[in-house]
Each structure stands twice: as C-alpha cells, then as structure tokens.
C-alpha cells in the first residue's frame, strides 16, 4: 500500500508523541556524539516538516522517503567531521549508500562517559520541572549507548521509567521507592539490549535466512498448538519488524510490531492459549507481554518425527521440491516436541538433518544412507547437557563471584588478546548464566542458559569487531552462529601467546577503591585476576586463588587502617613482591 | 508474476523418445525445486519427477524410473524432461510446476503450474 507521503502515513499511524520518540531514537542511535539539545532541534525540525505533510501531502519534498529525510537531517549538522571523522563522508553518499554507511558507522562501543545516577531529590526536582524533556533525555542517553537498541522496546521501558517517578516522587521514602525500580530497569535494559544486538547481528551477519531459522524454532516452541503455516506466517512478519529495526527504519518498525500484536490478539485461538492476559494491555504493555509469554502446552499425542522426515519414501522428493520449506517443517516439529531444548541445539540439529539430505538424496539408495540420521542427534544433545550440569555443580559450589572469577580465568586463558575491560565484562556475564538458569528445573535449564550463553558471546563477537586482536575470536565469531558456544568452549590456551610484561602500576591500588560499591570493587579485583592472568598464562588455580586471597585480605586490611593511602602504598608493594614470587614472575 | 511455459510434446510410437522443454520466468529459478507432473485422460495429476534447485538431487516415479532423465540449465532458466521408451501410458498432459509459498509440498494442485503440452503415445 503506496503513500503518497511516507512522512505523513508514519505520523498519522504512530501519533506525534511516538513519532518524536522514535525520530529521536533514530537520530541519537546514528549520531551518537551530538549534545541532548541538538538532537531535540533536529527531531523538531523533522516533527513540523511531517505536520506540514499530514496536512498536505502534495507540498514540497513529502514524497521524499524517510531515510532521504532523516539522512538529510543529519547532514546538516555543522560539527559532524570535527565529531565523527570519516562518517562525515556518508553525507557525500546517495541514499540507500549513505544510510548504509550511518549504519556501518554505529559504535557499540562509544567513548562515553558512565551514567552517573544523581540524588533521588536533584532527579525528582527535574522531572517535576521538564517532565517531558527528563524523559527525553533517557530516550537520548540509552539510545546513544546502545544504538541496537530495539526502538519500541524503548518506548515501553520509557513508559516504566515515567511511572516510577510519577509514582516515587511523591512517595514518603523517595529512594527506598525509586531506587529498585531503576535498578530493575537498568538491568533489564542492559539483557534487552544485548538480546536486540544478537537479532541484529544474526541478520546483518548471517542473513534473512539465518534470523527466519532461529524464529521458526522459538516461535514453535513458544506456540506448540498453531499450524506451521500459522508460525510461517508470524516468523516472516517478525523477520520484516526486525529487518527495519536493525536497519534504523525505526518509524516502520513500531508501526509494523503494532500491527503484528494486533494480528496475534486477534487470531490468539489458533495460536496460543498463553496469550489472553497479554492481548488485554495496551500497545507497548502487550507487545513486550507477547514477546516474553511462556511456552504454551504441547498438543497431546503429536505423532513420532521419524514417519515424515525418515520413513517417509517422500523425504528426498520432498526436500528437493522445497528445501527451505521442508527444512522449516522438520525445525517446526521438532520445535515444538522440544521447549526442553535451546534455540540454537535445535539448529544445529536442522543443520545436520539438511547436511545429510545433501548427500543422501544424491546417492544411490538414498533411504539406507538417511535412515539413521536421528542418531546423529545423540552426541549434539548431550554435548549442551553435559556441559551445563558441570557448569551448574560449580556455580553450587562457588557461588556468582568465584565462578565469574572462574570463567576469567579460562577465557582470558583461551583468548588472553582481547582487551581487559571486553574480557571483564563478557566473563561477568558468562557467569552469571549460574544465577539466571541453574536454579531451574532440568528441563528448562539448557534453553534458558545455552541462548543466554549466545547472547553474550555476541557481545564479545561485536566488541571484538570493532578493533580485531585474536583469529580465534573472529574464527568463532564468523564460521557459524550457531555454533560459537561450542566453538569457544572447545578452545584450550592459547600456546601462542607471548605473555605480558609485567608493570607494577596495574597493580598498584589506592584508598579509592575503599568507597567503591560492593560491584565496582568486584570488577577492580577481576581486572587484576585478567591482567595476573596475561601476565602468567600458566598459572595455575591454587597459585591464582592464593594471590587473590592476598589481595581481598590487602584490600580488607588497607581500608580499615586510619592512614589508608599510605597502607595502600606499602602493602601495594609487599603484595606485589609476594605475588611475583608466588607466581615465579 | 510467476511464468511457466512447456514445450516439446507431441505424437510418438511406442518406444520412441520426446524431450520436453519449460521456461521459467517471474521467480529466482535458481534457488527453486523444479516438478513435472501429468495428467492422463480423466485422471487426476500424478506426479511424474523432481529436480532440485542446484541439480544435485533427481527423484523419479516408480512408473519412470529408468526411462525419464530430468535436468535443468540455471543459465537459461530452464528445466527439462527427456522421455525414453514411451508406453501407451505415458500419454497426459506434462505440466511442469513449482512450489508457491504456503501451498502443502506435494499438494500439486497448489503448486504455480503452466499450461502444459500434450504428449501422445499409440502405435
């Protein structure tokens, strides 16, 4: 359905207030270095000129689309090659170069400072002033840091945000009020983001096809009872909402996400019973309920795979009549047999069914050369099984904090290349899979914590894009999506590494760290363990555990002494000597 | 739109050979699984054989196996029947077919068809 104006039909479908959200979002998520305030004139810039189109399509350059009108936007700003270097040569470009080098140009990881969180009083005092433009200012600071993140999903945690200061400035303990519900949103911010940047990367690194295959499976384990025609259909719908998102058509994307809600809440019998307390909240509400609804119940005596995908005398005609299709039908059923199951083991099982397809239906009996193509399962299945009871015995056994430190320890021992902070903060949230999924029962632990796993392996794929350090990365990164869990826990120590000099100065600690949040003097002690680490790959546990009791016990120790920097300077030394000792440095 | 055009049928003896042509347009022919289907005389269609996208896999009736040879050239968006030893039997019109999306596979009554070309077998 051709607009005349597309400036115009995305104004009307969204309304002004998402509209300006959204254009906001965009505008930030691409220039993600511009002050707040020109950011708010451009997007009113952008706001009048769609007003002016929705009054009168026909009027001048409302025909135009939505990237030539934002691309322009942002060409305009005056400081853009000062800021951004060689960005500025996008503006140079026609559309659609130009809007696929702004997206060529997105920083995961831009050199901005830390979020401060101020006082519960100087937030409360702003709201309360400028209600519209504190919320704007989130909208602004999230989407700079996070230029993945999945627009609509902003605006819904924006929604919360709001509601949290509505509700707590007027609360008699503010903080005791505001405080959780930040914390809570942060973190879930932080998950949603990383979750969003894995959909990206699926699609922009490994295609359509790849992103369709991971739906087909978590939409079929998520609604068992619908049809596969059904699932086909919201699996290519979701792939176009993502497409957009992924691509910073953010105006498209919201609008399209809305529609495919309102086509879920409407057609809810034929696909899942899980989704009537969802349907009954308003749009960002139920659209974010429907993306996180709990598997719906499996129909009872779904019949045995093997009749259709082995015993059948139709595979092979099948297969080759439509590949993708047939392909998709078996990751559907098995799907849908398999919520015990992760996304990614699923397929990776899809793929070994297609790679023997390949070669068995080019053979000469092809039916003996597939028949036994379900045992090929077996060792796929156990591989995630196996290494998730093992992982969870440890997590028991150490609790979050030393199984992060763990999982320091053989990552920077796989990769001992990739920079300090990267290997931090990956291995945190390696390990805090403990925590997240080793408290489920049997049959929900594999998929909650192997598509975890994947989502922050992304973020070590992404980080480690932006300046390449180690083959391996990139090898695991780049051969195949679903594989690079099994790919990075596969890799011993790196043999090849030149261990780093050893300096002093990382060592060397300060008070400082004695007024550091319980987390922040965590992530000061990992860092040493990473840098001990680089320093000495050989090192073993005990050796590693014993330097790393030393400091806690430094630590401890210096920030009860009434002349701590001083404490801090000489023991700094005792414990460095002692180390080095420990450790044959 | 999708576009399928046969040719090539025509009379023969018992015995004799034909080699039936269809070109494809309107689609990516390269990356789609290519049937031949017939029809004889007051039957329903029968599915007759299957090449897929990239020619490595060929599947055959048990009523052709041996006789028909199907193949395709990606290049000129263009699948083929060679048909061998032709029985009485044979006689239907061949359609050559492929499959539209959200059709069941194997449901040919579903599938993008053309109009066929009539291939006539008796002595």
């Known amino acids: 359905d051709a607009h005349k104006s597309e400036v115009a039909h995305r104004f009307k479908d969204l309304g002004e207030e998402n509209f300006k959200a959204l254009v906001l979002i965009a505008f930030a998520q691409y220039l993600q270095q511009c002050p707040f305030e020109d950011h708010v004139k451009l997007v009113n810039e952008v706001t009048e000129f769609a007003k002016t189109c929705v009054a009168d399509e026909s009027a001048e350059n409302c025909d135009k689309s939505l990237h030539t009108l934002f691309g322009d936007k942002l060409c305009t700003v005056a400081t853009l090659r000062e800021t951004y270097g060689e960005m500025a040569d996008c503006c140079a470009k026609q559309e659609p170069e130009r809007n696929e080098c702004f997206l060529q140009h997105k920083d995961d990881n831009p050199n901005l400072p830390r979020l401060v969180r101020p006082e519960v009083d100087v937030m409360c005092t702003a709201f309360h002033d400028n209600e519209e433009t504190f919320l704007k200012k989130y909208l602004y600071e999230i989407a700079r840091r996070h230029p993945y993140f999945y627009a609509p999903e902003l605006l819904f945690f924006a929604k919360r945000y709001k509601a949290a200061f509505t509700e707590c400035c007027q609360a008699a303990d503010k903080a005791a009020c505001l405080l959780p519900k930040l914390d809570e949103l942060r973190d879930e911010g932080k998950a949603s983001s990383a979750k969003q940047r894995l959909k990206c990367a699926s699609l922009q690194k490994f295609g359509e096809r790849a992103f369709k295959a991971w739906a087909v499976a978590r939409l079929s384990q998520r609604f068992p009872k619908a049809e596969f025609a059904e699932v086909s259909k919201l699996v290519t719908d979701l792939t176009k909402v993502h497409t957009e998102c992924c691509h910073g058509d953010l105006l498209e994307c919201a609008d399209d996400r809305a529609d495919l809600a309102k086509y879920i809440c409407e057609n809810q019998d034929s696909i899942s019973s899980k989704l009537k307390e969802c349907c009954e909240k308003p749009l960002l509400e139920k659209s974010h309920c429907i993306a996180e609804v709990e598997n719906d119940e499996m129909p009872a005596d779904l019949p045995s795979l093997a009749a259709d995908f082995v015993e059948s005398k139709d595979v092979c005609k099948n297969y080759a009549e439509a590949k993708d299709v047939f392909l998709g039908m078996f990751l559907y059923e098995y799907a849908r047999r398999h919520p015990d199951y992760s996304v990614v083991l699923l397929l990776r099982l899809a793929k070994t069914y297609e790679t023997t397809l390949e070669k068995c239906c080019a053979a000469a009996d092809p039916h003996e050369c597939y028949a036994k193509v379900f045992d090929e399962f077996k060792p796929l299945v156990e591989e995630p099984q196996n290494l998730i009871k093992q992982n969870c015995e440890l997590f028991e056994q150490l609790g979050e904090y030393k199984f992060q430190n763990a999982l320091l320890v053989r990552y920077t021992k796989k990769v001992p290349q990739v920079s300090t902070p990267t290997l931090v903060e990956v291995s945190r949230n390696l390990g805090k899979v403990g925590s997240k999924c080793c408290k489920h029962p049997e049959a929900k632990r594999m998929p909650c914590a192997e598509d975890y796993l994947s989502v922050v392996l992304n973020q070590l794929c992404v980080l480690h894009e932006k300046t390449p350090v180690s083959d391996r990365v990139t090898k695991c990164c780049t051969e195949s999506l679903v594989n690079r869990r099994p790919c990075f826990s596969a890799l011993e120590v790196d043999e090849t590494y030149v261990p780093k000099e050893f300096n002093a100065e990382t060592f060397t600690f300060h008070a400082d760290i004695c007024t550091l949040s319980e987390k922040e003097r965590q992530i000061k002690k990992q860092t040493a363990l990473v840098e001990l680490v680089k320093h000495k790959p050989k090192a073993t546990k005990e050796q590693l555990k014993a330097v790393m009791d030393d400091f806690a016990a430094f630590v401890e120790k210096c920030c009860k002494a009434d002349d701590k920097e001083t404490c801090f300077a000489e023991e700094g030394k005792k414990l460095v000597a002692a180390s080095q000792a420990a450790l044959g440095l | 739109q999708v576009q399928l055009l046969e040719s090539g049928g025509g009379e023969v003896q018992p015995g004799g050979s034909l080699r039936l042509s269809c070109a494809a347009s309107g689609f990516t022919f390269s990356t789609s699984g290519m049937v031949w289907v017939r029809q004889a005389p007051g039957k329903g269609l029968e599915w007759v054989s299957t090449i897929s996208d990239d020619a490595r896999i060929t599947v055959y009736a048990e009523s052709v196996k041996g006789r028909f040879t199907i193949s395709r050239d990606n290049a000129k968006n263009t699948v083929y029947l060679q048909m061998n030893s032709l029985r009485a039997e044979d006689t239907a019109v061949y359609y050559c077919?492929?499959?539209?999306?959200?059709?069941?596979?194997?449901?040919?009554?579903?599938?993008?068809r053309g109009q066929g070309t009539l291939v006539t077998v008796e002595p």
């Open positions: 077919a492929t499959y539209r999306a959200g059709s069941r596979i194997g449901s040919y009554e579903d599938y993008y």
